[in-house]
């Protein structure tokens, strides 16, 4: 279970008309459910139940986004429509270049994601918890365009980190 280094870049327009980019660094773990490789894309928050919907209405999906899913306490969803792995699979099928799960309220999901799969996804499936998860969700909940850059080694040059 390798460390996933996640840079979240937030794009904000300043009064002068320039873009200010705020970069926040956080760490997660690559799960065995997916590949250990770099990925990047716009952050799209997905509700766990939103991944249940199977009516494939689109002819073509849009590719290259990073799905962020905050998992709920298992008690709140005793009979999930899909396993956590199934949800990751569904997101990747819909064009996600990576999936990040906030497992803070459902730590059991870590084991589910790390069960040796015969057919792991070809895209990274990362999980975050604790302070890193809080940091991520704070960004996701802002009305801002944000992009995640996931790397399997620390960023080469030191990045300025802004606490969101």
């Amino acid at each position: 279970k390798e460390t996933a280094f996640v840079e979240v870049v937030l794009f904000e327009s300043s009064p002068s008309g320039d873009y200010t980019t705020y970069t926040t660094g956080l760490t997660g773990r690559f799960s065995r459910a997916g590949a250990t490789l770099s990925a990047e894309g716009e952050i799209v928050q997905m509700h766990p139940l939103g991944l249940c919907n199977n009516n494939d209405e689109e002819d073509l999906y849009e590719y290259g986004w990073v799905g962020v899913v905050k998992l709920e306490q298992p008690e709140l969803d005793p009979k999930p429509c899909l396993t956590v792995l199934g949800k990751a699979k569904r997101a990747v099928q819909r064009g996600a270049t990576a999936v990040i799960f906030d497992v803070s309220e459902n730590p059991e999901a870590i084991d589910q994601l790390n069960q040796g799969s015969e057919d792991p996804l070809k895209r990274p499936v990362v999980y975050v918890k604790g302070a890193d998860a809080i940091k991520l969700m704070n960004i996701v909940n802002k009305q801002k365009v944000a992009r995640a850059r996931i790397q399997h080694r620390p960023p080469r040059q030191p990045t300025e980190y802004f606490d969101m």
């Epitope: 209405e57 365009v145 944000a146």
Partner: antibody, heavy 116, light 107 residues
Framework: EVQLVESGGGLVQPGKSLKLSCSAS????????MHWIRQTPGKGLDWVAY???????VYADAVKGRFTISRDNAKNTLYLQLNSLQSEDTAIYYC??????????WGQGTLVTVSS | DIQVTQSPSSLLASLGERVTITCQTS??????LNWYQQKPGQAPMLLIY???SLQTGMPSRFSGQYSGRSFTLTITSLEPEDIANYFC?????????FGAGTKLELK
């Protein structure tokens, strides 16, 4: 079937305003980011603005402070408010679905002509 | 802002010929560049995304490559229906920017 239909274009005087609409159907509109792109007749493409699923927005330098992108998920509609219009804003305006970039689906465009 | 320089601006080619169009970016953008095809009177269509991935439904004679800040669109053997305008777009950081376009015509 995924469809995007732009409307609201027309002839407008310099300095005046216009509001473009893009009506979406055939997909879950609220789940997708949306772009506006424009094209001066017979010329190249210019990316104009983007709105994310959580209503975060970014704009091209040329329109910043004058144009406003917005969305109404209940009405499955994307908007572009054009203020302080200039002759250089004359173009066909397209809406397109996508996250980081305008993707697989574009509308057929609506023509905005700015002239006195 | 990231500048995108596309060349050539126009291109005359014969049917069956190999065609190459290039976009150069002013800074490193990883693989965050797309190619679009636009036929007269139509909206642009996504042809290649993330520099090398062919959009579903597009013919396999189209391909994309990149090295550093240089991106290439190749048509291995030109067909009549490929006569169109081609644009590249960088989507690494906003504001996103298109190349000026290449008008591909039959010789």
């Amino acid at each position: 079937e995924v469809q995007l239909v732009e409307s609201g274009g027309g002839l407008v005087q310099p300095g005046k305003s216009l509001k473009l609409s893009c009506s979406a159907s055939g997909f879950t509109f609220s789940s997708y980011g949306m772009h506006w792109i424009r094209q001066t007749p017979g010329k190249g493409l210019d990316w104009v603005a983007y709105i994310s699923t959580n209503s975060g927005t970014v704009y091209a330098d040329a329109v910043k402070g004058r144009f406003t992108i917005s969305r109404d998920n209940a009405k499955n509609t994307l908007y572009l408010q054009l203020n302080s219009l200039q002759s250089e804003d004359t173009a066909i305006y397209y809406c397109a679905r996508g996250y980081n970039y305008p993707g697989a689906y574009w509308g057929q465009g609506t023509l905005v002509t700015v002239s006195s | 802002d990231i500048q995108v320089t596309q060349s050539p601006s126009s291109l005359l080619a014969s049917l069956g010929e190999r065609v190459t169009i290039t976009c150069q970016t002013s800074q490193s953008i990883s693989n965050n560049l797309n190619w679009y095809q636009q036929k007269p009177g139509q909206a642009p269509m996504l042809l290649i995304y993330y520099a090398t991935s062919l959009q579903t439904g597009m013919p396999s004679r189209f391909s994309g490559q990149y090295s550093g800040r240089s991106f290439t669109l190749t048509i291995t053997s030109l067909e009549p229906e490929d006569i169109a305008n081609y644009f590249c777009l960088q989507h690494y950081n906003p504001p996103y920017t298109f190349g000026a376009g290449t008008k591909l015509e039959l010789k």
